[in-house]
Amino acid sequence: KKEDGESTAPTARPKVLRCKCHHHCPEDSVNNICSTDGYCFTMIEEDDSGTPVVTSGCLGLEGSDFQCRDTPIPHQRRSIECCTERNECNKDLHPTLPPLKDRDFVDGPIHHKHHHHHHHHH
């Protein structure tokens, strides 16, 4: 369950949210801005050569709760943060790669950046 009185099921925003997009701009984006009914995100992950790559964009409401949940993937270093508090809020997200050692927990934190800029943990 999420903290701060949020319900577990994501609810539709009353209005469209604009996000910065980079390496992840859909066809309907304009000037590196995409639109969504869900979340803005910024993600860092290693490419095949081990170089960190930062991607940002929009996540639709459908399935975004799962995608914003930073669940560890075996043999893949990746971190994602999501936000909704204002347009282009993902400009201010700076996720960092998790440490190299194997992580021994299965369910990672939900990385939703909100007004207070703290992470919600289970």
């Epitope: 009353p14 209005k15 469209v16 604009r18 859909p26 066809e27 309907d28 984006s29 304009v30 801005i33 995409c34 639109s35 969504t36 009914d37 869900g38 929009c58 639709g60 409401l61 459908e62 204002r86 347009n87 282009e88």
Partner: antibody, heavy 116, light 112 residues
């Protein structure tokens, strides 16, 4: 009920600027974008741009960049559109409209006449 | 910009008839979220437009069930099952998938 109140008409001289207003009531002003749309007889409807009152974020139709400036006053739940360097081409009806994912409510429109 | 092409420009009907208006877009209106942001409005003389149908087929509150919308991708239709006098005016389709948002040129529904 949702209402968007606009003055009925404005008359201005060529080369001047004008600030059109749109006062919102009946809903939480910051929960929706405000759009502006131009309508000239026989020219259909043209989207000028939109502003999100919660963070004053704007998006413009490239065609109206430099012509229109969108602003809001959240304390009075009023949106404004400033039009500059007016010519006869700017004579039209200008509507404000509430936008979430589509426009659901429109103001009655302000008829702008640019004439010397 | 996405061009919205409406046909016919004028639609003469008798009261009680069915009316059908077509709207085609120059590119797909399916948004990256999966939604299709195609909407229909009616504008009566001297008034602002009124929302009839949003997201292809959803009737806005207070809109009679004789109005229906259908379509997908680039091809959309508004149908009025039995035209009443209050339905006369200019019908516009509109898309809010791609910025800048654009409108059809309008279809004038008039009495035959």
């Amino acid at each position: 009920q949702v209402q968007l109140q606009q003055p009925g008409a404005e008359v201005v001289k060529p080369g001047a600027s004008v600030k059109l207003s749109c006062k919102a009531s009946g809903y939480t002003f910051t929960n929706y974008w405000m759009q502006w749309v131009k309508q000239r007889p026989g020219q259909g409807l043209e989207w000028i741009g939109e502003i999100d009152p919660s963070d004053r974020y704007t998006m413009y139709n490239q065609k109206f960049k430099g012509k229109a400036t969108l602003i809001v006053d959240t304390s009075s739940s009023t949106a404004y559109m400033q039009l500059s360097s007016l010519t006869s081409e700017d004579s039209a009806v200008y509507f404000c409209a509430r936008f979430g994912y589509y426009v659901d409510y429109w103001g009655q429109g302000t008829t702008l006449t640019v004439s010397s | 910009d996405v061009v919205m092409t409406q046909t016919p420009l004028s639609l003469p009907v008798s009261l009680g008839d069915q009316a059908s208006i077509s709207c085609r877009s120059s590119q797909s209106l399916v948004h990256s979220t999966g939604n299709t942001y195609l909407h229909w409005y009616l504008q009566k003389p001297g008034q602002s437009p009124n929302l009839l149908i949003y997201k292809v087929s959803n009737r806005f509150s207070g809109v009679p069930d004789r109005f229906s919308g259908s379509g997908s991708g680039t091809d959309f239709t508004l149908k009025i099952s039995r035209v009443e006098a209050e339905d006369l005016g200019v019908y516009f389709c509109s898309q809010s998938t791609h910025v800048p948002f654009t409108f059809g040129s309008g279809t004038k529904l008039e009495i035959k």
